[in-house]
């Protein structure tokens, strides 16, 4: 009367799941570092660059020790979604100067998207509560000048680099507690 039921779904080893997420994060971290260095070579940065629309850094000096897995993954996913949006905006509105960073920016965008999907999968595999769908974000205003686009690129890549470092540190610390 129909096929026999399949084998019960084996709960994956959370450490192995985290390992593959950490690998993707480390790989993206290296890509981001390389691209930020490329940007600095072509358009040297004069001091720190900020962009109000970027997420605030998810960490403070004491925060790493108190991390919990659901909080890390939820916050990381939210921040990376924002960075994905900013990278897409940079490619679309960044101006001709930033065309010299293609195809690397495109590769970065694709890898960022892949990491986000990986985080989504990890959260469902670990049966963590899924965050509500993100409200539509207001559109990002185009940079006021070519130099504005370059400053934005410095801010986006610098912030992403720091966020990914925080992510690797947090995920590896959490792994030691599993």
């Amino acid at each position: 009367p129909g096929p026999p039921p399949g084998p019960p779904r084996v709960s994956p080893d959370p450490r192995a799941e985290l390992d593959s997420t950490v690998l993707l994060t480390r790989s993206l971290l290296a890509d981001t570092r390389q691209l930020a260095a490329q940007l600095r070579d072509k358009f040297p940065a004069d001091g720190d660059h900020n962009l109000d629309s970027l997420p605030t850094l998810a960490m403070s000096a004491g925060a790493l020790g108190a991390l919990q897995l659901p909080g890390v993954l939820t916050r990381l996913r939210a921040d990376l979604l924002s960075y994905l949006r900013h990278v897409q905006w940079l490619r679309r509105a960044g101006g001709s100067s930033l065309k010299t960073l293609e195809p690397e920016l495109g590769t970065l965008q694709a890898r960022l998207d892949r990491l986000l999907r990986r985080l989504q999968l990890l959260m469902s595999r670990l049966a963590l509560p899924q965050p509500p769908p993100d409200p539509p974000a207001p559109p990002l205003a185009p940079p006021s000048s070519a130099w504005g686009g370059i400053r934005a690129a410095h801010a986006i890549l610098g912030g992403l680099h720091l966020t990914l470092d925080w992510a690797v540190r947090g995920l590896l610390l959490l792994k030691t507690r599993l």
Epitope: D19, S20, L23, T25, R26, S27, L29, A30, R33, L57, M59, S60, A61, A63, L64, H161, L162, L164, D165, W166, V168, R169, L172, L173, K175, T176
Partner: antibody
Framework: EVQLQQSGPELVKPGASVKISCKAS????????MDWVKQSQGKRLEWIGD????????IYNQKFKGKATLTVDKSSSTAYMELRSLTSEDTTVYYC????????????WGTGTTVTVSS | DIVLTQSPPSLTVSLGQRATISCRAS??????????MHWYQQKPGQPPKLLIY???NLESGVPARFSGSGSGTDFTLNIHPVEEEDAATYYC?????????FGGGTKLEIK
């Protein structure tokens, strides 16, 4: 030239604390983590922990929690390690070392600071 | 913590010959083509110096006679042809997990 210049040798009494400094030059201080490594007399290397100079986030080897405290002063590109409740076991050389973000390999090493604990 | 065991503890190699140093990890430090193993050289009275990172990438300024290979739990540092200035102690180090740990070292002597 990229350099990490450490403070000089320290002679301290058992139970006391010591603070070692490591001044970075020749690179952007906030682009790398600062890690600390202990080299015991038998030449064994042990990772103590690291700090991200951007926001002061630290990670410690469980073995050194409560023994070492890592801090940075971004304005002077200097990292510090304080060691407390010193015993003869802590007599050895300590290195600061530049760590690649997220990858923990160490491409630049400090000059080393010898700490001697003796009454 | 992952334990790294180096062999041999000491090694004597003739000038111009090949030196091979092994490092075995107590669990795999590789996945998806990435291996988080690194090699350092240390001479007496000096700090360690990075030679090879991520298994096989030569640090800038390091001579091409140094090479690294391996995956999973077994890694190798090769030096060929060995020169007099290569007399030193060599350490492997992993960064797969926290905390990163180092091997016990291999002392290379040249004859």
């Amino acid at each position: 030239e990229v350099q990490l210049q450490q403070s000089g040798p320290e002679l301290v009494k058992p139970g006391a604390s010591v603070k070692i400094s490591c001044k970075a030059s020749g690179y952007t201080f906030t682009d790398y983590n600062m890690d600390w490594v202990k080299q015991s007399q038998g030449k064994r290397l042990e990772w103590i922990g690291d700090i991200n100079p951007n926001y002061g986030g630290t990670i410690y080897n469980q073995k050194f929690k409560g023994k070492a405290t890592l801090t940075v002063d971004k304005s002077s590109s200097t990292a510090y390690m304080e060691l407390r409740s010193l015993t003869s076991e802590d007599t050895t050389v300590y290195y600061c070392t530049r760590g690649e973000l997220g990858h923990w390999y160490f491409d630049v090493w400090g000059t080393g600071t010898t700490v001697t604990v003796s009454s | 913590d992952i334990v790294l065991t180096q062999s041999p503890p000491s090694l004597t190699v003739s000038l111009g010959q090949r030196a091979t140093i092994s490092c075995r990890a107590s669990k795999s430090v590789s996945a998806s083509g990435y291996s988080y193993m690194h090699w350092y050289q240390q001479k007496p009275g000096q700090p360690p110096k990075l030679l090879i990172y991520l298994t096989s990438n030569l640090e800038s300024g390091v001579p091409a006679r140094f090479s690294g290979s391996g995956s999973g739990t077994d890694f190798t540092l090769n030096i060929h042809p060995v020169e007099e200035e290569d007399a030193a102690t060599y350490y492997c180090q992993h960064s797969w997990d926290l905390p990163p740990t180092f091997g016990g070292g291999t002392k290379l002597e040249i004859k």
